[in-house]
Interface confidence: medium
């Protein structure tokens, strides 16, 4: 790993995966196990992230890149680079300090994470409730009562047909 001396910073020629070793007169030494340097010219290697406990390894640490973690089943990532794992709840629940709690009446959560959100207020758009909301699903708003008068026609275009066996991307 010895490299030719540059006239500028003597460390600039050390590639990723090495560090400019102060203790060895600034030769490029390989990063030791469980450490990495992702850019060239570094004077130190960074300690690899360890995916322990509720974290599991998504990508192993290498000499040039840090490990990447995700969460074990029943948990989901929060924060940049999955810095935290938060417990999953069922649909129709939200996570509180005391654990998973059912959504209050008038709110719903259609995911395993996040908070319960209020049902849509159809009347604000001059519409009526077509399908009632549940803890897991929002209400479905329908046409306003006026639109339901005899002779009124729906202006909603038909949904495009899908090929059988294909799920939406």
């Amino acid at each position: 790993f010895e490299r030719t001396r540059s006239l500028q910073d003597p460390c600039s020629n050390c590639p990723a995966g090495t560090f400019c070793d102060n203790n060895r007169n600034q030769i490029c030494s390989p990063c030791p196990p469980n450490s990495f340097s992702s850019a060239g010219g570094q004077r130190t290697c960074d300690i690899c992230r360890q995916c322990k406990g509720v974290f599991r390894t998504r990508k192993e640490c290498s000499s040039t890149s840090n490990a990447e973690c995700d969460c074990t089943p029943g948990f989901h990532c929060l924060g940049a680079g999955c810095s935290m794992c938060e417990q999953d709840c069922k649909q129709g629940q939200e996570l509180t300090k005391k654990g998973c709690k059912d959504c209050c009446f008038g709110t719903f959560n259609d995911q395993k994470r996040g908070i319960c959100r209020p049902w849509t207020n159809c009347s604000l758009d001059g519409k009526s409730v077509l399908v009632n909301g549940t803890k897991e699903r929002d209400v479905v708003c329908g046409p306003s009562p006026a639109d339901l008068s005899p002779g009124a026609s729906s202006v909603t275009p038909p949904a495009p047909a899908r090929e059988p066996g294909h799920s939406p991307q």
Epitope: D21, N22, N23, R24, N25, Q26, R43, T44, C45
Partner: antibody
Framework: QVQLQQPGAELVRPGASVKLSCKAS????????INWVRQRPGQGLEWIGN????????NYNQKFKDKASLTVDKSSNTAYMQLSSPTSEDSAVYYC???????????????WGQGTSVTVSS | NIVMTQSPKSMSMSVGERVTLSCKAS??????VSWYQQKPEQSPKLLIY???NRYPGVPDRFTGSGSATDFTLTISSLQAEDLADYHC?????????FGGGTNLEIK
């Protein structure tokens, strides 16, 4: 846990060389630098040199180049510093201390021995 | 060799006061500066590494700052147990050097 064990004191006759020991435990001895540091009474810290046990690579402070010689015995996880031709000027506490060898802690010394008090006197 | 100069040589402060210790390098050492605390009759202990990183277990009243040639150790609220000598050292050059130390007394 990491420990660096040093004898508490050494009484040395002027001119008679002395070999100070530093026994390491609680970590992989070969992958951390061992530094030696001198502290005279009421004074600051003076870096003598360091050694990498894996291959016995050494660095010395020029001031101590002819005074101190650093060695290791990997089989017993022990580092040694031999002081040659000691005079009263060499009376001091001598510390061995561990330093991470990969720069991850910016070459800081993270563990220190208790120090050996060397008295050079006839 | 890189020379590290600490100031003041000694100081006497009261419990609860904010304390600032200075360390100057004779040339640019980046952030490769450590601070050590040495209590009477004890060996030094690492407080700060990389100029500003607090070593695990060190109380958060100790803060390091600075880069290049000027470095500072701050104790936000002095405690009686902080009576000690404080040393800075550089690891930028493979020839390590330490400052002369600052002796901190409690009034």
């Amino acid at each position: 846990q990491v420990q660096l064990q040093q004898p508490g004191a050494e009484l040395v006759r002027p001119g008679a060389s002395v070999k100070l020991s530093c026994k390491a435990s609680g970590y992989t001895f070969t992958t951390y630098w061992i530094n030696w540091v001198r502290q005279r009474p009421g004074q600051g810290l003076e870096w003598i040199g360091n050694i990498y046990p894996s291959d016995s690579y050494t660095n010395y402070n020029q001031k101590f180049k002819d005074k101190a010689s650093l060695t290791v015995d990997k089989s017993s996880n022990t580092a040694y510093m031999q002081l040659s031709s000691p005079t009263s000027e060499d009376s001091a506490v001598y510390y061995c201390a561990r330093e991470a060898g990969d720069g991850t802690h910016y070459y800081a010394i993270d563990y220190w021995g208790q120090g050996t008090s060397v008295t050079v006197s006839s | 060799n890189i020379v590290m100069t600490q100031s003041p040589k000694s100081m006497s402060m009261s419990v609860g006061e904010r304390v600032t210790l200075s360390c100057k390098a004779s040339e640019n050492v980046g952030t490769y500066v450590s601070w050590y605390q040495q209590k009477p009759e004890q060996s030094p202990k690492l407080l700060i590494y990389g100029a500003s990183n607090r070593y695990p277990g060190v109380p958060d009243r100790f803060t390091g700052s600075g880069s290049a040639t000027d470095f500072t150790l701050t104790i936000s609220s002095l405690q009686a147990e902080d009576l000690a000598d404080y040393h800075c050292g550089q690891g930028y050059s493979y020839l390590r050097t330490f400052g002369g130390g600052t002796n901190l007394e409690i009034k």
